[in-house]
Amino acid sequence: KLTIESTPFNVAEGKEVLLLVHNLPQHLFGYSWYKGERVDGNRQIIGYVIGTQQATPGPAYSGREIIYPNASLLIQNIIQNDTGFYTLHVIKSDLVNEEATGQFRVYPELPKPSISSNNSKPVEDKDAVAFTCEPETQDATYLWWVNNQSLPVSPRLQLSNGNRTLTLFNVTRNDTASYKCETQNPVSARRSDSVILNVLYGPDAPTISPLNTSYRSGENLNLSCHAASNPPAQYSWFVNGTFQQSTQELFIPNITVNNSGSYTCQAHNSDTGLNRTTVTTITVYAEPPKPFITSNNSNPVEDEDAVALTCEPEIQNTTYLWWVNNQSLPVSPRLQLSNDNRTLTLLSVTRNDVGPYECGIQNELSVDHSDPVILNVLYGPDDPTISPSYTYYRPGVNLSLSCHAASNPPAQYSWLIDGNIQQHTQELFISNITEKNSGLYTCQANNSASGHSRTTVKTITVSAELPKPSISSNNSKPVEDKDAVAFTCEPEAQNTTYLWWVNGQSLPVSPRLQLSNGNRTLTLFNVTRNDARAYVCGIQNSVSANRSDPVTLDVLYGPDTPIISPPDSSYLSGANLNLSCHSASNPSPQYSWRINGIPQQHTQVLFIAKITPNNNGTYACFVSNLATGRNNSIVKSITVSASGTSPGLSAGA
């Protein structure tokens, strides 16, 4: 079907448009273009008879049209009046007519917009401002930008009048920004210059600086006042209620004790008509006082609280110094000094931060020291320790257990045997014990200040016979050439000898074997697969002896370099190829094969029936031990010859 495509569909005034013809029939006599949706001789633009190779302009020809042999029509220097439909009338050689209509729209190139405002100096929290994008243009879209960003979502921002007007209700100082509007139509987009909104605000409550309120006699007093305000505030100073001067700064040289008093700064905004005041009390000392330390927390809790130590009083133009444990401050990320060195902050205090702390004020002649301050850091209780560490006793001896837990204030202790409370003491003493005294001995430590409690339980066995020992290990699956293993013979018993056997033999001499802890612990450094043996420990005293059950060490190793069998590398065509891969590994490895780099199957055996020369190539076996995280591989070249071409070839499996 004959169709007309307008390129582009939306055309800017002054530009050009191509009415492109699709599916033009073959065997044409000629064609003619018309303005409008129908064939009308009075509105003919141009006609073309192919056989004459000549085009004839019609009544609607403007000189801006160019016709092409493929019937497409180019219209140049487009004007608004060109908008609309265009009809192509095609006459075929058999004199059958065909028509198609296309259209395009013409839009003006937009002018640069500008912003008008209904209020050039709005007052904060009081006025609204309406910005309007000029000029009003038909078929144009209006957009707004604030600081070159699209409009934020805000209930105080409202678009109206087809987005041509942007209203800001209840303006705030934060609305002081660059505002731009943009006009768009299908052919152009233009942005205005920015308009800066000037919001009148303030004054806010003024701030007087510097903050220090203590001065020494003879110093200069120089106070500055500032209040956020637009336009900038006008300032006035009052001393003890009496007006002094209308300046932002107040300067009094060589002050005396008589200059002590209340100093008021008043800020006034002439446009908003608002006033705000701030008062500071200034104290002038005859001589520098002895400094003293104040703390914001007298009983800080370890690892929880921070403590701020402040050197008082605050005196202008003074150097503050600090000492901890009679030393200057150590470098520590937990110690922070304020800009004026007057405040020392200890972040996340520890029990080691008790001090003593001293501060000093340096004057012309000497340094005045404060009295030392010691921090009372509350901590603990830590896990209590029960001593001695023995767990086996013989009947008839005295049992004397002592409990200790680091704590501030000192912990309160309680003893329980088999869950039953015994006494509230730090030590537990039982004379002439019997088998009946065997059981669970619990020490409970309690910190009354923090409310925290911690307990430790110890199993005590009273027996003439030594128990059957057992072996505990710090690593149940060590990796070869990487890990160490420590075996410990349990339990720990009084007046007892500990012995070790490996595979039923006494310990071999080896630099990798080490006994410690009264021979109770056996450590194997850098284990190897040969260390995977049966380990037994024994205990003995003057009355009895006993041995543990054997513990077999499970050493993870490998995979070693795999071996592919059979070793043959030459095969006859038609034979079966049956390759098996094996690698020493614990645990057993995962196997996979690749032929010429292409992954095959995840099996230990690779089987290919009736091989041909196409099966020539490199056969790689990959092994991987997930436990050790190690991998290995081997590559074998296989050659397959056509039957009977080479002597000594394997027939395969």
Partner: antibody, heavy 118, light 106 residues
Framework: QVKLQQSGPELKKPGETVKISCKAS????????MNWVKQAPGKGLKWMGW????????TYADDFKGRFAFSLETSASTAYLQINNLKNEDTATYFC???????????WGQGTTVTVSS | DIELTQSPSSLSASLGGKVTITCKAS??????IAWYQHKPGKGPRSAHT???YIQPGIPSRFSGSGSGRDYSFSISNLEPEDIATYYC????????FGGGTKLELK
């Protein structure tokens, strides 16, 4: 881009025949007619006629009927001007020029000089 | 047949100046007129076509006007490369050239 490339200069004797070529490129040859223009030494341009490259039909100006023949080799996108029984007054530069659909000449060849001398 | 009378046959002008060439037809040619610039040893090239609105490659210094039988072609702000012979052409089913105007530098 559109280009019309004409053959080189010719030196002929009176009574002989000359055939000059104009090879077109950069457009579909059969879409536009081809004109021939003569410029005798020291004279102005003179339109000789044109050939319809679609139908092959030639049109000759009155002064160029008889000894002059326009022809085509469409497959080679080439137009030819043949002058038979050359005379001394045929000494001139001959231009081929493509005719836009609106009939004015939009592209020209560089010209071929024909000299007729005994 | 339509005849075109082009004048002047030659013309001297200064660089930066303006020149005007006229062409008079023996009858109304309905603005079917084109102007060509011809330099020795080269093929002529379009200088202006009155019927066509936009002509790529033609300097804006070149302009044409006229209707009925009388037509003119002007070059403003003359430049060295404008020195050539200029012809008017009436184009229709049959074509007619004017006699040419040789433009020289003063």
């Amino acid at each position: 881009q559109v280009k019309l490339q004409q053959s080189g200069p010719e030196l002929k004797k009176p009574g002989e025949t000359v055939k000059i070529s104009c090879k077109a490129s950069g457009y579909t040859f059969t879409d536009y007619g081809m004109n021939w223009v003569k410029q005798a030494p020291g004279k102005g341009l003179k339109w000789m006629g044109w050939i319809n490259t679609y139908t092959g039909e030639p049109t000759y100006a009155d002064d160029f009927k008889g000894r002059f023949a326009f022809s085509l080799e469409t497959s080679a996108s080439t137009a030819y001007l043949q002058i038979n029984n050359l005379k001394n007054e045929d000494t001139a530069t001959y231009f081929c020029a493509r005719k836009d659909l609106l009939r004015y000449f939009d592209y020209w060849g560089q010209g071929t000089t024909v000299t007729v001398s005994s | 047949d339509i005849e075109l009378t082009q004048s002047p046959s030659s013309l001297s002008a200064s660089l930066g100046g303006k020149v005007t060439i006229t062409c008079k037809a023996s009858q109304d040619i309905n603005k079917y007129i084109a102007w060509y610039q011809h330099k020795p040893g080269k093929g002529p090239r379009s200088a202006h076509t009155l019927h066509i609105y936009i002509q790529p490659g033609i300097p804006s210094r070149f302009s044409g006007s006229g209707s009925g039988r009388d037509y003119s072609f002007s070059i403003s702000n003359l430049e060295p490369e404008d020195i050539a012979t200029y012809y008017c052409l009436h184009y229709d089913n049959l074509h007619t050239f004017g006699g040419g105007t040789k433009l020289e530098l003063k």
